[in-house]
């Protein structure tokens, strides 16, 4: 079976000891209060039973307190994401206490040993929180633990061991190896805090999944399906890194959870919304863009507290970089007849025209197949805010772009050489905006011309009934 490798380190064929020769290792956890936005500042070290540093370093007992918990490390140094997150928290919550949990000596080990150390580190954090609770005005409800990778499970242990209930735990792509399918007391779980929200960015159903696939929080958000993150493909990575490798892809996708969270802190005017759905395929079909009954939520720091009886899996698409927000649209296309479709699925593209901007040409992903005499649902998303939609251009691509489709066309031709022209009839397209929850119906410009065939296009304009609002709540979220 595949062996775990380093979420925050180098991709290795096998586990091995870090390059350090270990002498005089203290099994230690340090708590560094980041007292300045300057990342070079050494900060203040807090220790249980010593009240002086709390006073010297102006620890604010009534403010929010964030604990940032790193994960496994091959290098023994703090990864660069940590400083970004510290800075973003300081920017967003000026009075808050930001504490970095430094467990590098225990994380700079074999992955399996680091996993075994998570419990010890969780205990240390719980002890610190228990001690802080003895102080006047300090409230556990104001504590927000933010754990990346292995650090997410450390946060889970801390929440489990502390006397009382921590306000919130955010798991940023919690580690998968040795935690997938584990008992709830041996991993991050919803009972570890009053609110547990999780971002999954590197899950794989084949091979080794660096991030945990299973839902482990009250809400589990899977950006881009939780696996392939835009801007993290080998081509993207090779573009920015001369000697880019699969390792860089792993790091990019795994770390994307941190950047999504940072984005939610610094770009609060551009919140990204996720939508509840049973699985990624259904989301890709555009079925799940509802905000009724708490079915949508802001992601990252701005997430609304939801304590569902059942775990809530949520999905969204994102851009390749900050700000990550995109605008989701559900497109319902009723195909009322088609001719000579043969074996191959058509390749459709849409262009959306709005009051603010026009979209690029967007592909309609056919998840299964086009059904006739049925409503086919698609998900499209744009990087820019188009405003109110005015018209839609639907294009059926002519020449096949894939070898598979070419082969199917060739087979179709062999079995039916005089295959008359393929044709599809569409009268209207219903569009729903995920972000505004508004619904609109578009009709063909010419009611007599509803047919579309390969290499042709069909134009749709807003039908006379205009915008239809269906008593649905907009995903606008009160910011914390």
């Amino acid at each position: 079976s595949p062996v775990p490798f380093g979420p925050e380190g180098r991709l290795e064929d096998k586990l091995h000891k870090p390059k350090a020769t270990q002498t005089e290792v203290k099994p230690s956890v340090r708590f560094n209060l980041r007292t300045s936005k300057d990342p070079e500042h050494e900060g203040c070290y807090l220790s249980v039973g010593h009240s002086q540093p709390l006073e010297d370093c102006s620890f604010n007992m009534t403010a929010k307190t964030f604990f940032i918990i790193h994960g496994w490390t091959m290098s023994g140094i703090f990864e660069n994401w940590l400083h970004k997150l510290v800075s973003a928290l300081h920017t967003r919550e000026k009075d808050a206490n930001v504490v970095v949990v430094d467990w590098l000596p225990l994380a700079h080990q074999l992955y399996t040993d680091a996993v075994n150390n998570t419990r010890v580190v969780g205990h240390s954090i719980a002890r610190m929180l228990d001690w802080l609770q003895e102080k006047d005005d300090f409230s556990l409800g104001n504590v927000h633990l933010i754990g990346y990778s292995l650090g997410a499970h450390v946060a889970g242990y801390a929440g489990n061991f502390v006397k009382g209930t921590v306000g919130r735990i955010t798991g940023l792509d919690p580690a998968g190896p040795m935690f997938e399918g584990a008992d709830i007391h041996k991993r991050l779980s919803p009972d570890d805090a009053d609110f547990v929200d999780v971002l999954h960015t590197y899950t794989r159903s084949f091979g080794l999944s660096i991030g945990i696939q299973m839902p482990v929080g009250h809400i589990d958000i899977y950006p881009n399906g939780g696996d392939f993150q835009p801007g993290c493909g080998l081509n993207d990575v090779l573009g920015s890194i001369a000697y880019g490798t699969i390792t860089e892809v792993v790091k990019c996708e795994h770390e994307r959870a941190v950047h999504l969270f940072v984005d939610s802190l610094v770009n609060q005017d551009k919140p990204s919304f996720a939508f509840q759905c049973t699985d990624s395929n259904r989301f890709k079909k555009g079925i799940c863009l509802s905000c009724r009954k708490n079915r949508c939520n802001s992601i990252g720091y701005n997430a609304k507290k939801m304590r569902n009886k059942r775990n809530s899996k949520m999905y969204l698409k994102t851009r390749a970089g900050m700000p990550f927000r995109v605008y989701h649209y559900q497109m319902k296309i009723h195909v009322f007849s088609y001719k000579n479709m043969g074996e191959i699925e058509p390749t459709f593209y849409v262009t959306l025209y709005g009051t603010n901007a026009d979209s690029q040409t967007l592909p309609l992903e056919i998840v299964e197949r086009i059904e006739q005499n049925a409503t086919n649902t698609f998900l499209v998303y744009t990087e820019e805010d188009l405003g109110d939609l005015l018209k839609i251009q639907l294009t059926w691509e002519g020449a096949s772009q894939s070898w598979y489709n070419l082969w199917k066309e060739f087979r179709s031709y062999l079995s039916q050489p005089r295959n008359p022209g393929r044709e599809l009839n569409i009268r209207r397209i219903r569009v729903k905006s995920g972000e505004t929850q508004r619904k609109l119906t578009f009709c063909t410009e010419d009611p007599e011309n509803t047919s579309i065939s390969p290499g042709r296009e069909l134009w749709f304009r807003k039908c006379r009934d205009g915008w239809r609002m269906k008593n649905e709540t907009s995903p606008t979220v009160e910011l914390p």
């Epitope: 350090a20 230690s28 400083h83 920015s240």
Partner: antibody
Framework: QVQLVQSGSELKKPGASVKVSCKAS????????LNWVRQAPGQGLEWMGW????????TYAGDFKGRFVFSLDTSVSTAYLQISSLKAEDTAVYYC?????????????WGKGTTVTVSS | DIVLTQSPASLAVSPGQRATITCKAS??????????MHWYQQKPGQPPKLLIY???NLASGVPARFSGSGSGTDFTLTINPVEANDTANYYC?????????FGGGTKVEIK
């Protein structure tokens, strides 16, 4: 003020060992990592590795595994570099330099350097 | 490991003139908006001294005649105007990941 004071020059024979010290003052020793940098005569700067002054965990660069050992005595805020089985090519100035655990980890404070000469 | 290539290897400048040294990295040393590129000055018989950190920030006590710029893989150290006591070797360094690496150095001489 913040400073790193290194031990004096050493003249050693091939095969011998040497231990260079670096004493920190003016700051909390365990709050910064301690790096070792080698500069051979007329050459550039070469990072040898570093030691986490809190945990005592050393990390060695590829060319410095084996004969080189980093150690600490936190009670006297001192880091040590020991080189065993000295060779002529170990002749160089050895610098200790401080870097933060946080931020961009540049080397903001340097010792004056210890010249180690290996000659028969 | 990231390789840093400095140019020119040596440079002779008259006092009052501008000296420009470049450093090219084999891969990007940027993380988000931060550049993990730094510059050091080493005078004969002395240890290196931090001049510029994070591509463009002047280290404490360094005169404003020194400035740094660049991002990604291409960085520049500028001394303007050059003074007689600027005779030294200048090194760039990256710390985006371990091992931190140094450029080969540029020897600046004052005419």
């Amino acid at each position: 003020q913040v400073q790193l004071v290194q031990s004096g020059s050493e003249l050693k024979k091939p095969g011998a060992s040497v231990k260079v010290s670096c004493k920190a003052s003016g700051y909390t020793f365990t709050n910064y990592g301690l790096n070792w940098v080698r500069q051979a005569p007329g050459q550039g700067l070469e990072w040898m590795g570093w030691i986490n002054t809190y945990s005592g965990v050393p990390t060695y660069a590829g060319d410095f595994k084996g004969r080189f050992v980093f150690s600490l005595d936190t009670s006297v805020s001192t880091a040590y570099l020991q080189i065993s089985s000295l060779k002529a090519e170990d002749t160089a100035v050895y610098y200790c330099a401080r870097r933060g655990y946080y931020g961009r980890r540049f080397f903001d404070v340097w010792g004056k350097g210890t010249t180690v000469t290996v000659s028969s | 490991d990231i390789v840093l290539t400095q140019s020119p290897a040596s440079l002779a400048v008259s006092p009052g003139q501008r000296a420009t040294i470049t450093c090219k990295a084999s891969q990007s040393v940027d993380y988000d908006v931060d550049s993990y590129m730094h510059w050091y000055q080493q005078k004969p018989g002395q240890p290196p001294k931090l001049l510029i950190y994070a591509a463009s920030n002047l280290a404490s006590g360094v005169p404003a005649r020194f400035s740094g710029s660049g991002s990604g893989t291409d960085f520049t150290l500028t001394i303007n105007p050059v003074e007689a006591n600027d005779t030294a070797n200048y090194y760039c360094q990256n710390t985006i990941e371990d091992p931190p690496t140094f450029g080969g150095g540029t020897k600046v001489e004052i005419k």
